[in-house]
Amino acid sequence: MAVTACQGLGFVVSLIGIAGIIAATCMDQWSTQDLYNNPVTAVFNYQGLWRSCVRESSGFTECRGYFTLLGLPAMLQAVRALMIVGIVLGAIGLLVSIFALKCIRIGSMEDSAKANMTLTSGIMFIVSGLCAIAGVSVFANMLVTNFWMSTANMYTGMGGMVQTVQTRYTFGAALFVGWVAGGLTLIGGVMMCIACRGLAPEETNYKAVSYHASGHSVAYKPGGFKASTGFGSNTKNKKIYDGGARTEDEVQSYPSKHDYV
């Protein structure tokens, strides 16, 4: 049960995380005009990865897309690339993890295949989360650098008579959404990897052992119990008798090589 819960929770957390990464990537408020210690203006500027916007004091907002590719800063292009890679990996990870979910039955898929898929999706979520965190952090670093540069040159003018106030930008909401979403995707990925360990059938070194109990015929083979779920490595090796109802994840004692002398 714990494995299913861990896998399911990992999937949900990653799903929320990837939705957050997509939202952050699409948001316009990656950087917002710094209002602290600045003259109050009738306009408010904010910028995203794809367009910049100006909101008048009336609330009327006008946005302009960045219709150039070559004219954009390399750092912005890098952030875009990281976010898109994060989204693509996350989306593929979600697709893979849906089929890997223990609670979903697809034909006669083996447990080892589910375990592998869970691990694959987990790794994809981890990389996706790291991409998002890296992208957001690169952008944040760019903002901090520009902020202090514009603070140093805040007032430039002709003989101090005419002043030009440079618009300074600070962290926008999208950065925080991106950090949280990237973190959630990362956590979801780790949970999937942990779940994978519980899903993988245990490798045993002994050969199949058979014994006859009076009145009952029970054939034990490695992976025998798992086979009863219909997901096992060999569906022909189903346990003929199960002495009591058990849940799929309940601990099953396998015969140890030390049990037979």
């Epitope: 009738a42 306009v43 004091s57 009336s58 609330g59 009327f60």
Partner: antibody
Framework: QITQKESGPGILQPSQTLSLTCSLS??????????VGWIRQPSGKGLEWLAH???????YYNTALKSRLTISKDTSNNQVFLKIASVDTADTATYYC???????????WGQGTLVTVSA | DIVMTQSPSSLTVTAGEKVTMSCKSS????????????LTWYQQKPGQPPKLLIY???TRESGVPDRFTGSGSGTDFTLTISSVQAEDLAVYYC?????????FGSGTKLEIK
């Protein structure tokens, strides 16, 4: 047709509170991005912005007069009000009410109302 | 507060002449976000309220004759009337609509010979 008509007391004494009303027609105060402002002009002098209010109740005041100014609106009656506390003779002017554009400029002006502060 | 300085304070021209008047602001009115200059020009004829002519430094309000042209960027702005008509007799004001408090210039009085 967009019109705005200002009304005021005409004459009042120093230290009293000046109450001005701007009655609007041709547009609604609840419409997105609509704003109404007050500007005054002493006789033969220049224009001075006092305050304005937006459709979403955002208010902006002239910092030099902020402590004495109160702007408000009554959306149902399509009216904007301005109160100026503790008036003195320097407040004698023609007071204009104006509708604002999407930005902080004034697109349509009323005819103005002359207010005289006299002892 | 932003100081708006208009020059000349008055000028007298003959009908049909080209006229230019200047407005300077103590700080740049150019918004980096949209590259627009937040400066507005008004015309106030004797005994009338002001009338909007130009906003965003160069965008003519609908119904304003095309002989009125606004130009300039940053801190220096100009209003040009290409061919003055008798009805252009008025005081022209510029307004900073970028920084609060909103401020007006002292005006340029245009007189016709």
């Amino acid at each position: 047709q967009i019109t705005q008509k200002e009304s005021g007391p005409g004459i009042l004494q120093p230290s009293q509170t000046l109450s001005l009303t701007c009655s609007l027609s041709g547009f609604s105060l609840s419409t997105y991005f609509i704003g109404v402002g007050w500007i005054r002009q002493p006789s033969g002098k220049g224009l001075e912005w006092l305050a304005h209010i937006w459709w979403n109740d955002n208010k902006y005041y002239n910092t030099a007069l902020k402590s004495r100014l109160t702007i408000s609106k009554d959306t149902s009656n399509n009216q904007v009000f301005l109160k100026i506390a503790s008036v003195d003779t320097a407040d004698t002017a023609t007071y204009y009410c104006a509708r604002m554009g999407s930005g902080a400029w004034f697109t349509y002006w009323g005819q103005g109302t002359l207010v005289t502060v006299s002892a | 507060d932003i100081v708006m300085t208009q020059s000349p304070s008055s000028l007298t021209v003959t009908a049909g002449e080209k006229v230019t008047m200047s407005c300077k602001s103590s700080q740049s009115l150019l918004n980096s976000g949209n590259q627009k200059n937040y400066l507005t020009w008004y015309q106030q004829k004797p005994g009338q309220p002001p009338k909007l002519l130009i906003y965003w430094a160069s965008t003519r309000e609908s119904g304003v004759p095309d002989r009125f042209t606004g130009s300039g960027s940053g801190t220096d702005f100009t209003l040009t009337i290409s061919s003055v008509q008798a009805e252009d007799l008025a005081v022209y004001y510029c307004q900073n609509d970028y920084y609060y408090p909103l401020t007006f210039g002292s005006g340029t009085k245009l007189e016709i010979k």
